[in-house]
């Protein structure tokens, strides 16, 4: 019995279906086919879970969180024992193993391994201003998304004709910050932060209005 090489890893957007491949060759009839799919979740590597089981001509549910979402892609028994997972969740990320036994065919590689990564587009980030908006001050524009896998990068732009940040601005696209030194009236305006990763983008808006000093009455 020989389980074929798997593609190594699969990426899928949260909520979308995933197919985890596992095929094998065997010299014996499929009368005593036994297939166990297991997962070692990324979130809890010490706690492997059963995903689905085929034994004695019957299918059995695995861990409760997979109930109603998992099945074999084809009619069993078969040499293609790939499974689907519907409505993928972040917690489905992990290393999946198919363990195949088909007595009396023993020997060879009977395990296939596939990694599953569930990707999440960035949630709309939160935009905020840190520091005084008085003319001449330094301000930091902050942008961060609560969700996003892979981790989002952040691009700030000023929504004027150029989309360029003021010349005194420095941007950190990993942290999502823009530091604007010595703000002036020209720093005023609407800024947009774009959070993006491999599968999506989202945005937030921030209105920076630099406060000019009020003229003082002398008298």
């Amino acid at each position: 019995l020989e389980v074929s090489e798997s593609p190594g890893s699969i990426q899928v957007a949260r909520g979308q279906p995933a197919v985890l491949p596992c095929t094998f060759t065997t010299s014996a009839a499929l009368i005593n086919l036994n297939v166990i799919w297991m997962v070692t979740p990324l979130s809890n590597a010490n706690q492997p879970e059963q995903v689905i089981l085929y034994q004695g001509g019957q299918m059995f549910d695995g861990a409760p969180r997979f109930h109603g979402r998992v099945g074999f892609t084809g009619t069993m028994p078969a040499t293609n024992v790939s499974i689907f997972i519907n409505n993928t969740q972040l917690s489905d990320t992990g290393t999946y193993q198919c363990l195949v036994n088909n007595l009396p065919d023993i020997g060879g590689r009977n395990i296939g391994v596939t990694g599953l990564t569930v990707l999440v587009p960035p949630s709309a980030p939160h935009c905020q201003i840190q520091g005084s908006q008085d003319i001449g001050s330094d301000v930091i524009l902050l942008c961060s998304s609560e969700e996003g896998i892979p981790r989002p990068t952040y691009l700030w732009e000023k929504l004027d004709n150029t989309l360029k940040l003021p010349p005194t601005a420095t941007q950190d696209q990993v942290q999502g910050t823009v530091t604007i030194r010595n703000i002036s009236a020209l720093s005023s305006g609407l800024y947009q932060c774009v959070a993006s990763n491999a599968i999506g983008t989202s945005t937030c808006l921030l209105d920076l209005q630099v406060i000019s000093p009020q003229p003082r009455n002398i008298g």
């Epitope: 709309a124 929504l159 989202s202 808006l205 921030l206 209005q209």
Partner: antibody, heavy 121, light 107 residues
Framework: EVQLLESGGGLVQPGGSLRLSCAAS????????MSWVRQAPGKGLEWVSA????????YYADSVKGRFTISRDNSKNTLYLQMNSLRAEDTAAYYC??????????????WSQGTLVTVSS | DIQMTQSPSSLSASVGDRVTITCRAS??????LNWYQQKPGKAPKLLIY???SLQSGVPSRFSGSGSGTDFTLTISSLQPEDFATYYC?????????FGQGTKVEIK
């Protein structure tokens, strides 16, 4: 009481110009960003343009960029929309709207009653 | 641009009914969502801001919920003055965009 009263609508030929005005009262006009939103007959709402409280920053929808100019006169508590090179698809009721203060840029908390602009030959 | 899709486009209901209107954004907009009511020949009126906050002076039978991409406006017990068109609007990104509207009619 917040009030927004606009004027200047009417019938204009394609390619023509029109200037809408919106007189504001009941709040500190210069402290609020203002906006224009339009609604074609029987259709939904479309944001057109916005301007910061000081008048130093202006924003436009792609559909009007280069043709419309938003401005304000804080001494007169008045918002303007200069519309040039008008097209049939600009036919709509035009509303001026106040934007909520602070971090809520883009929330329209008070609206005018609207003025109809008809572009037709 | 962020697309806003409302459903249904129209509905018929009776006074006292519970009415639910949904709004879906083409990308996550967190809670940067507003709801407006517009009666024929009148200006829109802000009902709900920040997805779930009731604007001052708006009756408590109106409520909003949701975050991310899916949002709901609920009228707990429809009153005669509630027959109107309702619009959602996002302020997460530029340009600001509205849903196409949901017309609530008398059954």
């Amino acid at each position: 009481e917040v009030q927004l009263l606009e004027s200047g609508g009417g019938l204009v030929q394609p390619g023509g110009s029109l200037r809408l005005s919106c007189a504001a009262s009941g709040f500190t006009f210069s402290s609020y960003a203002m906006s224009w939103v339009r609604q074609a007959p029987g259709k939904g709402l479309e944001w057109v343009s916005a301007i910061s409280g000081s008048g130093g920053s202006t924003y436009y929808a792609d559909s009007v960029k280069g043709r419309f100019t938003i401005s304000r006169d804080n001494s007169k508590n008045t918002l303007y929309l200069q519309m040039n090179s008008l097209r049939a698809e600009d036919t709509a009721a035009y509303y001026c709207a106040r934007m909520a203060a602070g971090a809520s840029w883009g929330t329209f908390d008070y609206w005018s009653q609207g003025t109809l602009v008809t572009v037709s030959s | 641009d962020i697309q806003m899709t409302q459903s249904p486009s129209s509905l018929s209901a009776s006074v006292g009914d519970r009415v639910t209107i949904t709004c879906r954004a083409s990308q996550s907009i967190s809670s940067y969502l507003n709801w407006y009511q517009q009666k024929p020949g009148k200006a829109p009126k802000l009902l709900i801001y920040a997805a779930s906050s009731l604007q001052s002076g708006v009756p408590s039978r109106f409520s909003g919920s949701g975050s991310g991409t899916d949002f709901t406006l609920t009228i707990s017990s429809l009153q005669p003055e509630d027959f109107a068109t309702y619009y959602c609007q996002q302020r997460s990104g530029s340009p600001l965009t509205f849903g196409q509207g949901t017309k609530v009619e008398i059954k």
